[in-house]
């Protein structure tokens, strides 16, 4: 009876202190405020460990809350010019560098680069272009950045364990957000409900990019923002599978993104989002 | 449905050794991050520790930090807790529970959005 | 880091409004969360992301946070809500927190 997947036991072996943020704002919640302009800002998500959009109204909010991502960035993850180490014993890779390869249910037959765990290199695969899992990167460069050790086990990319010059401890640290947790769907998914200025009481859902799921909320009839779909499943086309179903002052568009423009994040959400 | 279903609990000896396991059913087990609360008897709930979706990573509450190891069998969609070098302070019902998806990431969510039923840990001589 | 308190108990009458205090140091910066226990059951969420109820969680129970204060409140208190809530949130490496739980007694 095996106490975990046995390819993963040297990294369960140690524990790993959580995430250290730069500035204890940015663990904050995205606060809108109760002001109604609706301006895009940028707050870095502590339990996503990326920066994201979203509006705010205009007044008061906390100060998580930045001009651009840019800005974001560089308040709330770790500068490049931080030296990154990684051991056997210590690394903190992304849970998706541990999933076996995955073409997917398509037949796009789309080359792609995935890590192998066995080898302990990024290599080239077939990818249907649809479904699949979050082992799967555009370019040899990105999986390497991500899943790849450098040599002598240092980590040559965004994601490891940073030694920490005042103690000497090892602290993961996420030094930027990769290309590869940018959200490629449509951008209002990232925003927070909007009830807006009328006084009607609509049901509505929007999708709570905290926790990835599509909730209820009440729609005043007017105003609010394009996160807001009259059902559950629009929502989730919308946010979770790549189509775009805004709600604009003209009524309902409804488009179809082309998957290629998804990229990976097609099926990163398959891996990860099953249960809503 | 989705259910939770701790195992293993039991009386043991102060200094001794314990492994809790968890049965997951009703849901896509390797996608979610796992969590181990517990309750000390007539006490408050205590988070102990959590382990990421596929186990790369865990993070442990201080006072079980080094005495205590989550694990998870992904393909038996079971978690565990090996217990070690046992005090009476651990006395308690250890639950297992579910933390919600962190949007798009392989991190844990900010709660609980389902909860075992509870398995008791006495440790006492 | 962040630790939050609750007054240990909370009396009321049924069908008077019963309010369950969180404090914590900036709590209104970051998202509460309320679980309601029964004696030997588990804990069951009744509301996330400061005042988001559940579905299948009754529209009385309402929760709201700001500065160094969250608050559970339960209108038109049943005698069904007598139980212990607890409020949760999260430090700021990611870490979930509890509160110490208030028993409710509705009188």
């Known amino acids: 009876d095996s106490e975990e997947d046995e390819e993963h036991t040297i990294i369960t072996d140690t524990e790993l202190p959580p995430l250290k943020l730069m500035h204890s704002f940015c663990a904050f919640k995205a606060d809108d405020g109760p002001c109604k302009a609706i301006m895009k800002r940028f707050f870095f998500n502590i339990f996503t460990r990326q920066c994201e959009e979203f509006i705010y109204g205009g007044c008061e909010g906390n100060q998580n809350r930045f001009e651009s991502l840019e800005e974001c960035k560089k308040m709330c993850t770790r500068d490049n010019a931080n030296r990154i180490i990684k051991t056997t014993l210590q690394q903190e890779k992304p849970d998706f560098c541990f999933l076996e390869e995955d073409p997917g249910i398509c037949r796009g037959y789309i080359t792609r680069y995935f890590y192998n765990n066995q080898t302990k290199q990024c290599e080239r695969f077939k990818y249907g272009g649809c479904l699949g899992n979050m082992n799967n990167f555009e370019t040899l460069e990105e999986c390497k950045n991500i899943c790849e050790d450098g040599p002598n086990g240092f980590q040559v990319d965004n994601y490891g364990t940073q030694l920490n010059a005042v103690n000497n401890s090892l602290t993961p640290q996420s030094t930027k957000v990769p290309s590869l947790f940018e959200f490629h769907g449509p951008s209002w998914c990232l925003t927070p409900a909007d009830r807006g200025l009328c006084r009607a009481n609509e049901n509505r859902f929007y999708y709570n990019s905290v926790i990835g799921k599509c909730r209820p909320f009440k729609y005043s009839g007017c105003g609010g923002n394009e996160n807001n779909f009259t059902s559950k499943q629009e929502c989730l086309r919308a946010c979770k599978k790549g189509f775009i179903q805004r709600i604009s002052k003209g009524g309902l568009i409804k488009t179809k993104r082309k998957r290629k423009k998804q990229r990976v994040k097609i099926a990163y959400e398959e891996i990860f989002v099953k249960n809503m | 449905q989705v259910q939770l279903v701790e195992s293993g609990g039991g009386l043991v000896q102060p200094g001794g050794s314990l492994r809790l396991s968890c049965a997951a059913s009703g849901f896509t087990f390797s996608n979610y991050a796992m969590t181990w609360v517990r309750q000390a008897p007539g006490k408050g709930l205590e988070w102990v520790s959590v382990?990421?979706?596929?186990?790369?990573?865990?993070y442990y509450a201080d006072s079980v930090k080094g005495r205590f190891t989550i694990s998870r069998d992904n393909s038996k969609n079971t978690l565990y807790l090996q217990m070690n070098s046992l005090r009476a302070e651990d006395t308690a019902v250890y639950y297992c529970?579910?933390?919600?998806?962190?949007?798009?990431?392989?991190?844990?969510?900010?709660?609980?959005?389902?909860w075992g039923q509870g398995t008791l840990v006495t440790v006492s001589s | 880091d962040i630790e939050l308190t609750q007054p240990p108990s909370v009396s009321v009458a049924p069908g008077q409004t019963a309010r369950i205090s969180c404090s914590g140091d900036?709590?209104?910066?970051?998202?509460a969360y309320w679980y309601q226990q029964k004696p030997g059951q588990a804990p069951v969420l009744v509301i996330y992301d400061d005042s988001n109820r559940p579905s299948g969680i009754p529209e009385r129970f309402s929760g709201s946070n700001s500065g160094n204060t969250a608050t559970l409140t339960i209108s038109g208190t049943q005698a069904e809500d007598e139980a212990d809530y607890y409020c949760q949130s999260y430090d700021s490496t990611g870490l979930l927190v509890f509160g110490g739980g208030t028993k409710l007694t509705v009188l």
């Open positions: 529970a579910r933390p919600t998806k962190a949007g798009r990431t392989w991190w844990w969510g900010p709660y609980m959005d389902v």
């Open positions: 382990i990421s979706s596929v186990g790369s990573n865990t």
């Open positions: 900036n709590i209104g910066s970051y998202y």
